[in-house]
């Protein structure tokens, strides 16, 4: 058993049919000596009597808020939340496994730039009764700071039959460098707790590898004259990290048919205009990515071919 | 401690060209030993990230864009002096900061550069000749050392009397070669900053 | 104590169908994952199918993915294995088992698919 | 499509000592706990070893687990004519899991 927060504990359990469970001793935060009683959660059911309760906790039934009291007076609480060890394994039933870039992705983050700011989104079917509480640190050893702000409901979706939540949470290194060589990796952590379930959940990257650039910006064609080409010009993305000539980009130039199944062209440059040509109906789309280590993609901007 | 924003004759920086073949090659190098030791902890999330070069050299802060020095946390306090007449420094006018800049550079790859021969050197006894370094990369390395051409005290290849472990030697070989790729990363984006400057 | 009750093997068809159960008690059958597990005449064990406490996640053996079905319900007490287009090499021995560091086994049930 | 590679067979006369193997990789024995059963003609497996080393109440201390790296292995120590069986490792994969990675089976003989 550990204190995740005042008068909050978890206790870790071996999760299996008829398993025995942990003994755990509540002790009522008081001066009084005398006449305590223990309750759980809304019943008036007497546990126990004294100013130390011991249980048996098995099942969720045992866990949640234990209050002892004198004399009709609650003296103090204690919530236990459960957090299930499956066959060696911690419990992952709170957030989905988002099976991107790889099974057992329940965190997912991205950086627009190299300033040391990133964002972490989740998903979960849970709609009530869920909190979250997010940590990160670059380095766990020899912890450096990273402040990460709430985490925040940020999208709802259906799938199917179920309602799909999306979380995300802000975070910033408090001294980053854009320049630097990563030598230790960033460390999410987030607690998650549903009902009197307790669930946490890691991520570790470098930012570098979790890099994808905001689309390309002002994104326009110049018909060339007596020609069916047009030259497609844009701009780094405002978001990009400076000096551009430091942190050059490199880009994708495609040129997409109304229909999908229409054959696409695509032209790659590090400059910021291409020569292109246009076809009716067609759209020319632009992405961009960092020129020398090739983490994501950029989404497209697009224009009209018309 | 920074790049200053020269305005150099248009192509003058010929080692702009060798930087994309160095970052290119050791790409390569290292796609081609993560496929080939599958079975070892060759991922970067797998090994630990060492700079071989840490406390020697200090390319990332001699080489810092001007625009970045207004950055605290870029600057940092080491300070390592350089010995500065470089080819690629084709102008008088270029500071004396750029010349410490890709002196650091080349001291870096003359670091990386030993310790490859020594570790290749090595993979060519193993006896299930399952990985050597790729020629192209060594050769790139010293065009790039060419371009840069400063004169500096030859390193001695290092030479190990005892049996290499071969397991350890190819464990090296992927921590050495993500933390080169990185630094080829940093030397392609000073290259190219400093060919538009 | 806990137990658990296999039913619903028998001799089938190649092609055709059929649906395994298992009873559980003696525990909160709601509050654990459960698998199903095979094995062929004179072979070893493999995994057919796993499915969630709440019946949310199931996953499968990629020999029987788009074949097999495993489903609870959970005011029933009972784990099931719906097989469709058997074949020849999905004869096994079929056991249903709890998920956890201490496991519980149902005592099999043989499937036969044969013409 | 086992990924967990045991002995087809290992035998011993009566008292003698027994191990068995189970080697796997990084993704599976390397990154996650093992269990070892014991399977009786026409009986469901039972469990020996979980968490690699632990004994479930039951279990004759004459068994023990152990893990190193990618490898895992069971030790008889003293081994006795009941003991003739079948014995299969266990564990996970980091891309798979919870699907459950079964070691391909060891035909232990008591000979005499």
């Known amino acids: 058993i550990w204190e995740l927060k005042k008068d909050v504990y978890v206790v870790e359990l071996d999760w299996y049919p008829d398993a025995p469970g942990e003994m755990v001793v509540l002790t009522c935060d008081t001066p009084e000596e005398d006449g305590i009683t223990w309750t759980l959660d809304q019943s008036s059911e007497v546990l126990g009597s004294g100013k130390t309760l011991t249980i048996q906790v098995k099942e969720f039934g045992d866990a949640g808020q234990y209050t002892c009291h004198k004399g009709g007076e609650v003296l103090s609480h204690s919530l236990l939340l459960l957090h299930k060890k499956e066959d060696g394994i911690w419990s992952t039933d709170i957030l989905k496994d988002q099976k991107e870039p790889k099974n057992k992705t329940f965190l997912r983050c991205e950086a627009k730039n190299y300033s040391g700011r990133f964002t972490c989104w989740w998903l979960t079917t849970i709609s009530t009764d869920l909190t979250f509480s997010v940590k990160s640190s670059r380095g766990s050893s020899d912890p450096q700071g990273v402040t990460c702000g709430a985490a925040t409901l940020s999208a709802e979706r259906v799938r199917g039959d179920n309602k799909e939540y999306e979380y995300s949470v802000e975070c910033q290194e408090d001294s980053a460098c854009p320049a630097a060589e990563e030598s230790l990796p960033i460390e999410v952590m987030v607690d998650a707790v549903h009902k009197l379930k307790y669930e946490n959940y890691t991520s570790s990257f470098f930012i570098r590898d979790i890099i994808k650039p905001d689309p390309p910006k002002n994104l326009q064609l110049k018909p060339l004259k007596n020609s069916r080409q047009v030259e497609v010009s844009w701009e780094y993305p405002d978001t990009w990290s400076t000096p551009h000539s430091y942190f050059s980009l490199t880009f994708c130039v495609q040129v997409q048919g109304k229909s999908k199944r229409e054959k696409k062209d695509r032209v790659f440059t590090d400059k910021t205009s291409a020569t292109v040509i246009c076809r009716k109906n067609a759209s020319i789309s632009v992405r961009a990515q960092d020129r020398y280590y090739s983490s994501s993609w950029s989404e497209w901007a697009s224009v009209p071919c018309s | 401690r920074n790049l200053p924003v020269a305005t150099p004759d248009p192509g003058m920086f010929p080692c702009l060209h060798h930087s994309q073949n160095l970052l290119r090659a050791v790409s390569n190098m290292l796609q081609k030993a993560r496929q080939t030791l599958e079975f070892y902890p060759c991922t970067s999330e797998e090994i630990d990230h060492e700079d071989i070069t840490k406390d020697k050299t200090s390319t990332v802060e001699a080489c810092l864009p001007l625009e970045l020095t207004k950055n605290e946390s870029c600057l940092n306090s080491r300070e390592t002096s350089f010995i500065t007449n470089g080819s690629c420094l084709a102008s008088r006018k270029t500071s004396f900061m750029m010349a410490l800049c890709l002196s650091s550079i080349y001291e870096d790859l003359k670091m990386y550069q030993v310790e490859f021969k020594t570790m290749n050197a090595k993979l060519l006894m193993d006896p299930k000749r399952q990985i050597f370094l790729d020629q192209n990369m060594l050769a790139v390395i010293d065009e790039l050392m060419q371009a840069l051409n400063f004169n500096s005290e030859t390193v001695p290849q290092k030479s190990s009397l005892e049996e290499p472990d071969f397991y350890k030697t190819k464990i090296k070989l992927c921590i050495l070669l993500h933390a080169f790729r990185i630094r080829a990363v940093t030397i392609d984006r000073v290259m190219s900053y400093l060919n538009a400057s | 104590q806990v137990q658990l009750v296999q039913s619903g093997g028998g001799v089938v068809q190649p092609g055709r169908s059929l649906r395994l159960s298992c009873a559980a008690s003696g525990f909160t059958f709601s509050s654990y994952g459960m698998h199903w597990v095979r094995q062929a005449p004179g072979k070893g064990l493999e995994w057919v199918a796993f499915?969630?406490?709440?019946?949310?996640?199931?996953y499968y053996a990629d020999s029987v993915k788009g074949r097999f079905t495993i489903s609870r319900d959970n005011s029933k007490n009972t784990l099931y294995l719906q097989m469709k287009s058997l074949r020849a090499e999905d004869t096994a021995v079929y056991y249903c088992?709890?998920?956890?560091?201490?496991?519980?086994w149902g005592q099999g049930t043989m499937v036969t698919v044969s013409s | 499509s086992y990924v967990l590679t045991q002995p087809p067979s290992v035998s011993g006369t009566p008292g003698q000592r027994v191990t068995i193997s189970c080697s796997g990789g990084r993704s599976n024995i390397g990154s996650h706990t093992v269990k070892w059963y014991q399977q009786l003609p026409g009986t469901a497996p039972k469990l020996l070893i979980y968490?690699?080393?632990q004994r479930p109440s039951g279990v004759p201390d004459r068994f023990s687990g152990s893990k190193s790296g990618t490898s895992a292995s069971l030790a008889i120590t003293g081994v006795q004519a009941e003991d003739e069986a079948d014995y299969y490792c266990q564990s996970y994969d980091r891309g798979t899991h919870p699907a459950l990675l079964f070691g391909t089976g060891t035909k232990v003989t008591v000979l005499g």
């Open positions: 968490g690699n080393d």
């Open positions: 088992k709890t998920h956890g560091s201490h496991d519980n």
């Open positions: 499915i969630r406490y709440d019946g949310s996640n199931k």
